[in-house]
């Protein structure tokens, strides 16, 4: 038994036929010693007398609000809730399995940007006697603060004969660092109480993995003269992180009729315009995704081909360029070839994702991820890799990136990747390895040697452990190269001569 909040206790029960249950001792919160009686819920039947009451809790009939009285006056209450465990698994009766992106997904979370603000939601078919409370932190062993609001009913839907209720909560990391590479996941814990049943649900994620931008705004069509082509332009959504030269999006532009089976024109764009072929009765749709990290695509923003006006949705100007002052030449150090570094780091991003595209197929955090990812270098908040830090002095950040590149290059050449089980011959790890080396050489100033980080002894003994370690290393490499690519893109846009 444990205390959920003041005067509310959770009794954990192994749930099987003829289970002995749990013996619980309740103590009346009063200085009085005698003349105390106990009742359960609205019943006037006296269950016992004395300052303490010992009960055997076996089923929901034994749970509820126990009240101690003296002479017709209520002294204190203790609410007992049950948390069922069947075959070693805690019950999950209150929330609905959303089955996306995998089975046993009860909580789903999304973030519109890297500000540390995110929304989680869950589904239930229960309409009454239901309460939720949400807690969150960054990391679990030495948790950093995340503040969550109250969970609220956000939608009601009819699904067949049943009504489905969606609840959501907004949370904000207290000291968010948008430009840093996350090393510890956000933990979200939801306590759910339905009548006398208690359940808890948890989710663990990095903000980068739950990013889903808002749709692009201000879609505009401009027919081109003497052509079937139309120039479509749009803007970054207002909610996306700034500056856009650092937090860049990529876009997919599609022209399609009402049916998904119809033929289509599709083009990808890094700029905020593209030229497409419009057809009668078709629509032009644009969606956005983080340019350097393969998180979710936004929903589509659409405009009909027939009208050449602007789309429904946001208006306003919202800049798309880097803006701001130029980066200063680096004191006491030479400036890198920003554009070359940008191209190579973007290539690294695509290679890192083709080497390990299985996002979410293997939940690595269940395998003690905090320890492993602490062994690899991360671009942290104080490393000067944010836009302001780059403007002040890019050397700190470039040195950190260089250290990381060397570290990962050595890891990819180590027996973690060369040992059994052998990599598939079509694995892009070889190209990734060569590109890491190429970028690190571009960064290393002539006659200047930055200190490199020692590689920890991560070498596992079992092939299956090696396989797991490869996945973890590639996942953290994806995050590392995304930050590096942002740095070089911003540098190329605001520093390159």
């Amino acid at each position: 038994i444990w205390e959920l909040k003041k005067d509310v206790y959770v009794v954990e029960l192994d749930w099987y036929p003829d289970a002995p249950g749990e013996m619980v001792v309740l103590t009346c919160d009063t200085p009085e010693e005698d003349g105390i009686t106990w009742t359960l819920d609205q019943s006037s039947e006296v269950l016992g007398s004395g300052k303490t009451l010992t009960i055997q809790v076996k089923e929901f009939g034994d749970a509820g609000q126990y009240t101690c009285h003296k002479g017709g006056e209520v002294l204190s209450h203790s609410l007992l809730l049950l948390h069922k465990k069947e075959d070693g698994i805690w019950s999950t009766d209150i929330l609905k399995d959303q089955k996306e992106p995998k089975n046993k997904t009860f909580l789903r979370c999304e973030a519109k940007n890297y500000s540390g603000r995110f929304t989680c939601w869950w589904l239930t078919t229960i309409s009454t006697d239901l309460t939720f409370s949400v807690k969150s932190s960054r990391g679990s062993s030495d948790p950093q603060g995340v503040t969550c609001g109250a969970a609220t009913l956000s939608a009601e839907r009819v699904r067949g004969d049943n009504k489905e209720y969606e609840y959501s909560v907004e949370c904000q990391e207290d000291s968010a660092c948008p430009a840093a590479e996350e090393s510890l996941p956000i933990e979200v814990m939801v306590d759910a109480v339905h009548k006398l049943k208690y359940e808890n649900y948890t989710s663990s994620f990095f903000i980068r993995d739950i990013i889903k931008p808002d749709p692009p705004k201000n879609l505009q069509l401009k027919p081109l003269k003497n052509s079937r082509q139309v120039e479509v332009s749009w803007e970054y959504p207002d909610t996306w992180s700034t500056p856009h030269s650092y937090f860049s999006l990529t876009f997919c532009v599609q022209v399609q009729g009402k049916s998904k089976r119809e033929k289509k024109d599709r083009v990808f764009a890094d700029k905020t315009s593209a030229t497409v072929i419009c057809r009668k009765n078709a629509s032009i749709s644009v969606r956005a995704q983080d340019r350097y990290y393969s998180s979710s695509w936004s929903e589509w923003a659409s405009v009909p081909c027939s009208g050449s006006g602007s789309s429904r949705g946001g208006s306003g100007s919202g800049g798309s360029g880097g803006g701001g002052s130029k980066l200063r030449a680096v004191p006491g150090g030479s400036s890198p070839a920003w554009t070359q570094c940008q191209q190579l780091s973007q290539k690294l991003c695509t290679l890192a994702w083709s080497a390990h595209p299985l996002v979410g197929h293997m939940d690595l955090r269940e395998e003690g991820d905090e320890e492993t990812t602490n062994d690899v270098p991360h671009i942290q908040c104080g490393d000067g890799c944010d836009p302001q830090g780059l403007r002040d002095n890019s050397q700190f950040c470039l040195q950190r990136i260089h250290q990381g590149l060397i570290f990962y290059e050595k890891l990819l050449g180590s027996d973690i990747f060369t040992g059994e089980p052998s990599l598939l011959p079509d694995s892009p790890v070889g190209q990734l390895h060569a590109s890491l080396l190429g970028l690190s050489q571009l960064l290393q100033p002539e006659g200047h040697h930055w200190e490199t980080q020692q590689i920890p002894s991560l070498s596992p003994s079992q092939p299956w452990q090696r396989l797991l370690l490869r996945f973890k290393i590639l996942r953290s490499l994806q995050a590392f190269v995304a930050v590096a690519a942002r740095v070089f893109a911003h540098g190329a846009a605001t520093l390159s001569p």
Partner: antibody
Framework: QVQLVQSGAEVKKPGASVKVSCKAS????????LHWVRQAPGQGLEWMGW????????EYAPKFQGRVTMTTDTSTSTAYMELRSLRSDDTAVYYC???????????WGQGTMVTVSS | EIVMTQSPATLSVSPGERATLSCRAS??????LHWYQQKPGQAPRLLIY???QSISGIPARFSGSGSGTEFTLTISSLQSEDFAVYYC?????????FGGGTKVEIK
């Protein structure tokens, strides 16, 4: 399955015209865009243009504008490419291809060799 | 128009070895790039679309990467049936244009 069968080889004199046909089967003809791509002997591939059989919309490469006409006959699921004012450097294999996506080429015909010689 | 440049023009590789083919665009084309294989006397065949998307029925040894102006087609372990000419094609803007091709021949 989706199939494109093209007409046979042609020999033409400079200044003449040629009309190559491409018969589609295995799908609803109006559901796919149709392109024409040519390849001169020992050379690379060159895109000529596309047609949407649903509405007859076309887009031609600037190089062929004014000299090429692409048409379709939905009743026979056949596409045609006519090239006029032929020159010797028009000697090539002409391919038709079809795809639900406008900008790349999924299903190819077997090709039609057109020789322009005096 | 966008000019596509493929290198090398000819690549001599032994069976079982890795082949890396490059394609460069004269301006940034995001991931609007597709790869084709053509064997003598045959029509080309689509291998990869949008830079890295694989086609069902195409062996997994063919993989594509890149974005912007630099693209790579990798054949991880060349089989005898892979000796052919490979073309890249951009679809960023009309006119659609192809690279000059890379001939992969037996060393």
């Amino acid at each position: 399955q989706v199939q494109l069968v093209q007409s046979g080889a042609e020999v033409k004199k400079p200044g003449a015209s040629v009309k190559v046909s491409c018969k589609a089967s295995g799908y609803t003809f109006t559901d796919y865009y149709l392109h024409w791509v040519r390849q001169a002997p020992g050379q690379g591939l060159e895109w000529m243009g596309w047609i949407d059989p649903e509405n007859g919309d076309t887009e031609y490469a600037p190089k062929f504008q004014g000299r090429v006409t692409m048409t379709t006959d939905t009743s026979t699921s056949t596409a045609y490419m006519e090239l006029r004012s032929l020159r010797s450097d028009d000697t090539a294999v002409y391919y038709c291809n079809a795809n639900k996506e406008l900008r790349y080429f999924d299903v190819w015909g077997q090709g039609t060799m057109v020789t322009v010689s005096s | 128009e966008i000019v596509m440049t493929q290198s090398p023009a000819t690549l001599s590789v032994s069976p079982g070895e890795r082949a890396t083919l490059s394609c460069r665009a004269s301006q940034s084309i995001s991931i609007n790039l597709h790869w084709y294989q053509q064997k003598p006397g045959q029509a080309p065949r689509l291998l990869i679309y949008f830079a890295s998307q694989s086609i069902s029925g195409i062996p997994a040894r063919f993989s594509g990467s890149g974005s912007g102006t630099e693209f790579t087609l990798t054949i991880s372990s060349l089989q005898s049936e892979d000796f052919a000419v490979y073309y890249c094609q951009q679809s960023n803007s009309f006119p659609l244009t192809f690279g000059g091709g890379t001939k992969v021949e037996i060393k």
